[in-house]
């Protein structure tokens, strides 16, 4: 078998054997290696020598392999836009963040760049579940057969409505979609100005 | 101004290292430029050695690659040549030599005024 | 690795006169990978001419270098007393780099 090429080596078709790893470098028509993540390109290649590669300084990242001549500068998590962080920077990777609890991405630009108050699902609703917190505005669902929500909240769940009979009590009235059952006790009446309490 | 200046014993016994530095000054030694040696037979052409750059990677010319060591000492600014099992054709004036440091192109815009090594027992 | 051929071995020329030296590649190195430098008796060699014919930092504009492929020509328009000295091109198309033998400018 031929032996592999080590970089710079000529290439007359633009491509190169490893395209994570290599580059094309047009002007001298040599495939190059590119910087690991972490690292920037200290000195650029020619057709007699490779690639050099630096360390990230401090606060400076870049995530993939490639042929930068500078790191990208780490960027806190900014708080007046919504955001908190979840891991901090490294020399291989951006600070990660994320919305803060309430609040939904509102603007996405590759990333989450602005986070806004999620919207209160009114009484008898609640917010449909997401795969992933913080993705997009809450939409609000009603609460299935059985169960109720009785606020106007971003994060209030619709909760099953009491069954009187596990407590030893009966129904005075039916729950709703935006209240729980009333129960009373079965040797008493229930009085028209306590209708949606339970007695005891 | 940038300067260069080489250093070392001016006569080696055959089979022995040749040692020499090279001293750089009114310039990083760390920056993006390779740093080179090149040599000189008496009345004869040039023949570059090798490079160095300050990271430590090394490129030699695959005629010597087998006796030559090159380092770097980013502290004193300098860098270094040694080349092993030296007979009496390695004589010449030793130069090193900055590589210009533009995209792609391996020529040397500074030189040190060069040092005459002997070998001769 | 790449031979570099340099003709004429000596050139005697006087003053005020134009200086044509030629360096020929053993292949092809493209347009870009030439230089040429000067050495005086005692002296290290000074880079005169990169890429082929760029002109380094600090060189009179009577120098000039042109050329491609394998045939390179650098040229003095109008010798100066401080022009003769030695020249020799130099080669970064390929592992190892290479210097042509040289050619001394002599006055005649």
């Known amino acids: 078998s031929q032996p592999q090429a080590v970089p710079p080596y000529a290439s007359e078709n633009q491509t190169c054997r490893d395209q994570e790893k290599e580059y094309y470098e047009p002007q001298h028509r040599i495939c190059c290696s590119r910087c690991p993540p972490g690292t920037y390109v200290s000195a650029k290649c020619s057709r007699i020598r490779d690639t050099v590669c630096a360390t990230c300084a401090e606060n400076s990242y870049n995530e993939h392999w490639n042929y930068l001549t500078i790191c990208q500068l780490c960027r806190p998590c900014d708080p007046v836009m919504g955001l908190e962080e979840i891991a901090p920077c490294t020399s291989k990777r951006k600070t990660q963040c994320r919305c803060q609890p309430g609040m939904f991405c509102a603007a996405w630009a590759l990333e989450c760049t602005h986070c806004e108050l999620l919207s209160d699902c009114p009484p008898g609703t609640e917010a449909e579940l997401k795969d992933e917190v913080g993705k997009g505005n809450n939409h609000c669902v009603p609460c299935k057969a059985g169960h109720f929500q009785n606020t106007s909240s971003p994060s209030a769940r619709c909760q099953p409505h009491t069954r009187c009979e596990n407590q030893g009590l009966v129904e005075a009235a039916p729950g709703t979609a935006q209240s729980d059952t009333t129960c009373k006790n079965p040797l008493e009446p229930l009085p028209p100005e306590m209708s949606g309490t339970m007695l005891m | 101004q940038v300067q260069l200046q080489e250093s070392g014993p001016g006569l080696v016994k055959p089979s022995d290292t040749l040692s020499l530095t090279c001293a750089v000054s009114?310039?990083?030694?760390?920056?993006?430029?390779?740093w080179g040696w090149i040599r000189q037979p008496p009345g004869k052409g040039l023949e570059w050695i090798g490079y160095?750059?300050?990271?430590?990677?090394?490129y030699y010319n695959p005629s010597l690659k087998s006796r030559v060591t090159m380092s770097v000492d980013t502290s004193k600014n300098q860098f270094s040549l040694k080349l092993s099992s030296v007979t009496a054709v390695d004589t010449a004036v030793y130069y090193c030599?900055?590589?210009?440091?533009?995209?792609?192109?391996?020529?040397?815009?500074?030189w040190g005024q060069g040092t005459m090594v002997t070998v001769s027992s | 690795e790449i031979v570099l051929t340099q003709s004429p071995v000596t050139l005697s020329l006087s003053p005020g006169e134009r200086a044509t030296l030629s360096c020929r590649a053993s292949?092809?190195?493209?347009?870009?990978?030439l230089a040429w430098y000067q050495q005086k008796p005692g002296q290290a060699p000074r880079l005169l001419i990169y890429?082929?014919?760029g002109r380094a930092t600090g060189i009179p504009d009577r120098f000039s270098g042109s050329g491609s492929g394998t045939d390179f020509t650098l040229t003095i328009s109008r010798l100066e007393p401080e022009d003769f000295a030695l020249y020799y091109c130099?080669?970064?198309?390929?592992?190892?780099?290479?210097f042509g033998h040289g050619t001394r400018l002599d006055i005649k």
């Open positions: 030599a900055r590589e210009t440091g533009s995209d792609g192109d391996d020529t040397f815009d500074i």
């Open positions: 009114g310039y990083s030694i760390s920056s993006r430029n390779w």
């Open positions: 160095i750059h300050y990271i430590g990677n090394t």
């Open positions: 292949q092809s190195i493209g347009s870009s990978y």
């Open positions: 890429g082929a014919s």
């Open positions: 130099q080669q970064c198309y390929s592992s190892p780099i290479t």
